[in-house]
Interface confidence: low
C-alpha cells in the first residue's frame, strides 16, 4: 500500500503540446487491475516540465473536469488532443 495526494495542475499548451506522454486505458492497463491513465514520460523543456509539478508515474484523474475513468487509451489520447490551449489536470501523486 502507498500514500497518494491529489493536485490540480493548470498547464498552457506550448509549441510542443503539453510536453508529456501517457500510458494506460481499459484496453492496455499500465498498472495491474487499474485502467487509469498515467504519465510515462515528461519532455525536457515542454510545458509540463517547465511547470514542474507533474511527475512521471502520476495518475491523471481528469482533464478539464472530464473524468478519465474507464476510457480506452485512444479515447484518452483524443481528450488530451482536444483539450484546448489552457488545460486543467487533476492528478494523483504517489508519495
Amino acid at each position: 500500500d502507498y500514500l497518494v495526494t491529489e493536485e490540480e495542475i493548470n498547464l498552457t499548451r506550448g509549441p510542443s503540446g503539453l510536453g508529456f506522454n501517457i500510458v494506460g486505458g481499459t484496453d492496455q492497463q499500465y498498472v495491474s487491475n487499474d485502467s487509469g491513465i498515467y504519465v510515462s514520460e515528461i519532455d525536457e523543456n515542454g510545458a509540463a516540465a517547465l511547470d514542474g509539478r507533474l511527475q512521471e508515474g502520476d495518475k491523471i484523474l481528469s482533464v478539464n473536469g472530464q473524468d478519465l475513468k474507464n476510457l480506452l487509451h485512444q479515447d484518452a489520447v483524443d481528450l488530451f488532443r482536444n483539450a484546448g490551449y489552457a488545460v486543467s489536470l487533476r492528478v494523483q501523486h504517489r508519495l
Epitope: G17, N21, V23, E41, G46, H73, Q74, R81
Partner: nanobody, 126 residues
Framework: HVQLVESGGGLVQAGGSLRLSCAAA????????MGWFRQAPGKEREFVSA????????YYADSVKGRFTISRDNAKNTVHLQMNSLKPEDTAVYYC???????????????????WGQGTQVTVSE
C-alpha cells in the same frame, strides 16, 4: 497544419544504405512527434520508427532495430531515417507522418498520426 515531403528513396543493392529525409512545411516540425511507416505491395502499412519532438526518445520496429536510425533537425524542420544493411524485404513505399500528441503505447499505430507525406519508393535488389 503541416505538409510533409519525403525524399531520398531509390534503388539500392542488398547490404547497401539509403538516407530518407522528411521536410515539414507549414509549421515547425518540432511541434510534432514524427514517425516513419512503410507499405509493401499487397501489405498493410507498418510502423518503422518514430522520434519524439525533442529527439530524446526514439522507437523502432523489431525488424529494423540495429540497422535503421531516426534523427531530427528541428532547426531545419527535417527528420531523417538512416537505413543501413538493407534487405530485399525492406522494399516498400516509405511514408513520413506527424503526430501532435505523443503517446508511447501507440507509436506503431498509423491512426495516431495527424499528417502524412506522399511517400518515397525504396527498392532493395538481391
Amino acid at each position: 497544419h503541416v505538409q510533409l515531403v519525403e525524399s531520398g528513396g531509390g534503388l539500392v543493392q542488398a547490404g547497401g544504405s539509403l538516407r530518407l529525409s522528411c521536410a515539414a512545411a507549414g509549421r515547425t516540425s518540432s511541434d510534432y512527434a514524427m514517425g516513419w511507416f512503410r507499405q509493401a505491395p499487397g501489405k498493410e502499412r507498418e510502423f518503422v520508427s518514430a522520434i519524439n519532438w525533442s529527439g530524446i526518445s526514439t522507437y523502432y520496429a523489431d525488424s529494423v532495430k540495429g540497422r535503421f536510425t531516426i534523427s531530427r533537425d528541428n532547426a531545419k524542420n527535417t527528420v531523417h531515417l538512416q537505413m543501413n544493411s538493407l534487405k530485399p524485404e525492406d522494399t516498400a513505399v516509405y511514408y513520413c507522418a506527424a503526430e501532435k500528441l505523443e503517446s508511447l503505447r501507440n507509436w506503431h499505430d498509423p491512426l495516431m498520426y495527424d499528417y502524412w507525406g506522399q511517400g518515397t519508393q525504396v527498392t532493395v535488389s538481391e
